[in-house]
Amino acid sequence: SKSSWGLENEALIVRCPQRGRSTYPVEWYYSDTNESIPTQKRNRIFVSRDRLKFLPARVEDSGIYACVIRSPNLNKTGYLNVTIHKKPPSCNIPDYLMYSTVRGSDKNFKITCPTIDLYNWTAPVQWFKNCKALQEPRFRAHRSYLFIDNVTHDDEGDYTCQFTHAENGTNYIVTATRSFTVEEKGFSMFPVITNPPYNHTMEVEIGKPASIACSACFGKGSHFLADVLWQINKTVVGNFGEARIQEEEGRNESSSNDMDCLTSVLRITGVTEKDLSLEYDCLALNLHGMIRHTIRLRRKQPIDHR
């Protein structure tokens, strides 16, 4: 059997668990006595279409309720275990009163007020986090949703929606609570050099300028001590002592999948024969370690026009 719960002195409306898409009439019974539940609205507990309404609910209403869907060729019976709880005395909402947890990871996120579609409610829905009314402009109530702008871990907690159900000219309060957690999007990884390829040889023209980019990615939200740099014959460019060869400071970039990447460009103003004998290392390092791609320069072969 399925379970439903509510709070004492609040409205509770439940659906027959066997209902599916059926349009056939539904009858409700107290399963322990087999006594039929009436459809007259003057009763505190009554049936309306496929729904069983407790207006308002009381602790003694707790029990198992049976619903029977009568169709021409088959009767389907469903059972619903209804528990009505006293209101918790403190702000700590016990687990048994919690609806499913919502997980957010985007900059903007929404929380849906659980079960609200069963009720005849009117806006606005009031929202509380850990029992405090939400008044910051980042929190926006719209229809049955709470929208949170610029979500951070501090937004995690228990969110309660409170709304009014109207029936027969009487208003009843309904509250429902669910947890909201923020999933981590960031991660840090061992550096991956995306350019130049491993053991690459680059063609250059003597006397002409050349530039080589060293690019590496480190994860998402993971700049801590991440760097890319060039070494020439295992010496950092600044200490190599060749003014023609300069390194452009690593700049931040994002890859197509939002990875944190850095690029450093090695510039040679005029390539000499000597440069062809040097070893150029593109290094990427972070907290997890270091990776190196070595490249060499080769004289570009003149195009044979014969």
């Epitope: 840090s188 801590f224 001590l225």
Partner: antibody, heavy 116, light 107 residues
Framework: QVQLVQSGAEVKKPGSSVKVSCKAS????????ISWVRQAPGQGLEWMGW????????NYAQKFQGRVTMTRDTSTSTVYMELSSLRSEDTAVYYC?????????WGQGTLVTVSS | DIQMTQSPSSLSASVGDRVTITCRAS??????LDWYQQKPGKAPKLLIS???NLGSGVPSRFSGSGSGTDFTLTISSLQPEDFATYYC?????????FGGGTKVEIK
């Protein structure tokens, strides 16, 4: 919510060693590195080194080379910092902190008192 | 090692005041600078990362700026809960180094 919970306060004799633990929860342990920072009474913050939870790669500040060892236990999502040959000037609060774009989550700190 | 020089080392201010703390690096550190707030007996808390990105749950009265070697933390309107010690941290090159701290006290 990411949490780093450190072991309790320690009182140690000069020349001995101390091992402080830092248990991580609420995030993917292997996605990050854990740094260790210490603070002597009434003083500023001092970097000690880090360990990669991903592969165990370590890097120690020059000052602590040869005296500090950082290890990890992936099965319990815990990192350890052991400092040996303790002297009175090692009396400090030792913090672990998760390193991403910054030191975004910190442990509550462990007070280590070195006294004869 | 890169030296981080923080100034002033302490300052007295009143609630509502605009407060500025500066941090100077002994060499260029690109954007790899964070600011932390520490209250007595507590662990430091990340305020700002990568020069100007506000940490989780940090009020918008805190802001960061600067580049290269000179960086600034600004509190636009000091609140009672802001009385604390503030540290900058560079993590452009190893080892990362903290500034000496700025203690913000009630005038």
């Amino acid at each position: 919510q990411v949490q780093l919970v450190q072991s309790g306060a320690e009182v140690k004799k000069p020349g001995s060693s101390v091992k402080v633990s830092c248990k991580a929860s609420g995030g993917t342990f292997s996605n990050y590195a854990i740094s260790w920072v210490r603070q002597a009474p009434g003083q500023g913050l001092e970097w000690m080194g880090w360990i990669s939870a991903y592969n165990g790669n370590t890097n120690y500040a020059q000052k602590f080379q040869g005296r500090v060892t950082m290890t990890r236990d992936t099965s319990t999502s815990t990192v350890y910092m052991e400092l040996s040959s303790l002297r009175s000037e090692d009396t400090a609060v030792y913090y672990c902190a998760r390193s991403t774009n910054a030191l975004d989550y910190w442990g509550q700190g462990t007070l280590v008192t070195v006294s004869s | 090692d890169i030296q981080m020089t923080q100034s002033p080392s302490s300052l007295s201010a009143s609630v509502g005041d605009r407060v500025t703390i500066t941090c100077r690096a002994s060499q260029g550190i690109r954007s790899n600078l964070d600011w932390y707030q520490q209250k007595p007996g507590k662990a430091p808390k990340l305020l700002i990362s990568i020069v100007s990105n506000l940490g989780s749950g940090v009020p918008s009265r805190f802001s960061g700026s600067g580049s290269g070697t000179d960086f600034t933390l600004t509190i636009s309107s000091l609140q009672p809960e802001d009385f604390a010690t503030y540290y900058c941290l560079q993590h452009n090159s190893n080892p990362p180094t903290f500034g000496g701290g700025t203690k913000v006290e009630i005038k």
